[in-house]
């Protein structure tokens, strides 16, 4: 249904507070770098001329595009040349070609301070003063360090932030009440980043065939009483709601999230049993409840999958037919089956039996050649199972912070050229994987674990390709979305590395180390486990064990010392010549 | 978890037939497709019958088909396999197994719980 004005269609679908945080976010985005003001100038601009267009929707450019509207807006911003350099000449270019040029600038690293916790008396004191700017701030912070945080989902966690300071500033301790759930929205914010960093990639990367499969797989476990056709729906609706988010279109795409809820919630019978409770909640929060619901139970009589796949003389018939079609008719079958497989084992499993198919149909006996086809399943299935089975094991032995730096050392080797913060960040989002998923049953351990690491993974090959420093890196990331794990898990010791330096500095520590908290004091040593490593790759375990042991006695001891800098400096130097002794430096 | 006890082997002449039953305790076992394999002397193990989680849908190698016969009784968390005609062949250890989630009920990585199995012998 085409409208006159785009921005007045959407501005009354959304509303103004809608409208207006979701551009404040869609900008923040784009231009990471602008100050807060500058935003909230350009968004108010935007707001305004919207405002008219509603009025009258044939008033002068209101039937111009969002791109053209917004890119122009931004285009007006008068330092973009100094703060973003090349980006500037994104605007002499016409649209979508505009667009697309803003969208290759977007930084998944950008440049920017640490968000630093005020006090809580502080940060009360701002909330009561102004709380529209206040929560403009946090959706303006949290955007421009997250470039594709899902837009409808920034508005739930803005919500929950403002519900968090409106019930803990009026607490006895508000501290108290406050801080754990600033926490718990800081950890699902950066998991809700992760996870919608990898759907754009997986669209933006390997094209909307694979994100596509991944949500067939996904939905068929979620719903798997919903028929193939209703699950096709839903597939189609979320890729085009997913689209328009990563492609910065976030008008379109918070539009498109609530009317999928709606439909999700008006044809719940011939979807899930589990939606009740999700489709009574406020829009923000239904949307959110039915991302996350948990899968509905089998059918009681699903039969062996056998038949239709492998069986009926009309299989190659079938797939010549519609290919696509007949191969998510498979995925659908297999993914409501499995529950207990990670989506991107069940998508591994659906390309070797496309393989088979392509190669079988085109045999003199087709169905002697793909009767065999799920004895190739076996191993498939089974590697993940056993490289879960022994994280685990080694995980429940050592501990989180102790199996995190086993990752360190083993993917430091795989690929030491990364640079080092990437290196810890990645090692320790990968080691969380443990308390995460190690505690679930097994039916439960592969889908939680495997689809986890995806997305951890992710985070290091959308890094890695901003400074691409290692072909073994740029290998596993774009070869294969579904093999992305498995390759990395294949990689050995990588003999061509040269040794780094050895530099005195990179171990200098100070008495400022004393006052981090356990998490940051945990990093600075992970980051000079990574180092060492980095100076002597072939180093063992025990080697590397008795110098981190080494290094913890130390920053414990001067931290308990009256002159504590005397003690780092003196003690450091010690703590040097023994570690290079000890690996041979 | 599910335990699993097969019972109803034994030695039996060509052409005989045989009941094996395989009783689970634990858990309910209608969220189980319930199947049996066999394992000849020397031999790898076979798929031989699978049935689906309410016993509409029945799944047999084609070496049995039309000879043995798959059941199920929820209600006493009992799944059976008739075996008619048999022949020398036959003979093997039978072992009855659950799968909370089988797809492909011929696979035994399918099949998350396994009996011990109970020896079947067909003399000539």
């Known amino acids: 249904d085409a409208h006159k004005s785009e921005v007045a269609h959407r501005f009354k679908d959304l509303g103004e507070e809608n409208f207006k945080a979701l551009v404040l976010i869609a900008f923040a985005q784009y231009l990471q770098q602008c100050p807060f003001e500058d935003h909230v100038k350009l968004v108010n601009e935007v707001t305004e001329f919207a405002k008219t267009c509603v009025a009258d929707e044939s008033a002068e450019n209101c039937d111009k595009s969002l791109h053209t509207l917004f890119g122009d807006k931004l285009c007006t911003v008068a330092t973009l040349r100094e703060t973003y350099g090349e980006m500037a000449d994104c605007c002499a270019k016409q649209e979508p070609e505009r667009n697309e040029c803003f969208l290759q600038h977007k930084d998944d690293n950008p440049n920017l301070p640490r968000l630093v916790r005020p006090e809580v008396d502080v940060m009360c004191t701002a909330f009561h003063d102004n709380e529209e700017t206040f929560l403009k701030k946090y959706l303006y912070e949290i955007a421009r360090r997250h470039p594709y945080f899902y837009a409808p989902e920034l508005l739930f966690f803005a919500k929950r932030y403002k519900a968090a300071f409106t019930e803990c500033c009026q607490a006895a301790d508000k501290a108290a009440c406050l801080l754990p759930k600033l926490d718990e929205l800081r950890d699902e914010g950066k998991a809700s980043s992760a996870k919608q960093r990898l759907k754009c990639a997986s669209l933006q990367k390997f094209g909307e065939r694979a994100f596509k499969a991944w949500a067939v797989a996904r939905l068929s476990q979620r719903f798997p009483k919903a028929e193939f056709a209703e699950v096709s729906k839903l597939v189609t609706d979320l890729t085009k709601v997913h689209t328009e988010c990563c492609h910065g279109d976030l008008l379109e795409c918070a539009d498109d999230r609530a009317d999928l809820a709606k439909y999700i919630c008006e044809n719940q019978d011939s979807i899930s049993s589990k939606l009740k409770e999700c489709c009574e909640k406020p829009l923000l929060e239904k949307s959110h409840c039915i991302a996350e619901v948990e899968n509905d139970e089998m059918p009681a009589d699903l039969p062996s999958l056998a038949a239709d796949f492998v069986e009926s003389k009309d299989v190659c018939k079938n797939y010549a037919e519609a290919k696509d079609v007949f191969l998510g008719m498979f995925l659908y079958e297999y993914a409501r089956r499995h529950p207990d497989y990670s989506v991107v084992l069940l998508l591994r499993l659906a390309k070797t039996y496309e393989t088979t198919l392509e190669k079988c149909c085109a045999a003199a006996d087709p169905h002697e050649c793909y009767a065999k086809v799920f004895d190739e399943f076996k191993p498939l299935v089974e590697e993940p199972q056993n490289l879960i089975k022994q994280n685990c094991e080694l995980f429940e032995q050592l501990g989180e912070y102790k199996f995190q730096n086993a990752l360190l050392v083993r993917y430091t080797k795989k690929v030491p050229q990364v640079s080092t913060p990437t290196l810890v960040e990645v090692s320790r989002n990968l080691g969380k994987v443990g308390s995460k998923c190690c505690k679930h049953p097994e039916a439960k351990r592969m889908p939680c674990a495997e689809d986890y690491l995806s997305v951890v993974l992710n985070q290091l090959c959308v890094l890695h390709e901003k400074t691409p420093v290692s072909d073994r890196v740029t290998k596993c990331c774009t070869e294969s979305l579904v093999n992305r794990r498995p390759c990395f898990s294949a990689l050995e010791v990588d003999e061509t590395y040269v040794p780094k330096e050895f530099n005195a500095e990179t171990f200098t520590f100070h008495a400022d180390i004393c006052t981090l908290s356990e998490k940051e004091r945990q990093i600075k040593k992970q980051t000079a486990l990574v180092e060492l490593v980095k100076h002597k790759p072939k180093a063992t375990k025990e080697q590397l064990k008795a110098v981190m042991d080494d290094f913890a006695a130390f920053v414990e001891k001067c931290c308990k010392a009256d002159d504590k800098e005397t003690c780092f400096a003196e003690e450091g130097k010690k703590l040097v010549a023994a570690s290079q002794a000890a690996l041979g430096l | 978890e599910v335990q699993l006890v097969e019972s109803g082997g034994g030695l039996v002449q060509a052409g005989g037939s045989l009941r094996l039953s395989c009783a689970a305790s634990g858990s309910n076992i209608s969220s189980y497709v319930m199947g049996w394999f066999r394992r000849a002397p020397g031999k790898e193990r076979e798929f031989v019958a699978a049935?689906?989680?309410?016993?509409?849908?029945?799944y047999y190698a084609d070496s049995v088909k039309g000879r043995f016969t798959i059941s199920r009784d929820n209600a006493k968390k009992t799944a059976y396999l008739q075996m008619n005609s048999l022949e020398p062949e036959d003979t093997a250890v039978y072992y009855c197994a659950a799968g909370r989630y089988s797809a492909w009920y011929s696979q035994s990585y399918e099949y998350d719980y396994w009996g011990q199995g109970t020896l079947v012998t067909v003399s000539s």
């Open positions: 049935i689906s989680r309410s016993g509409g849908y029945t």
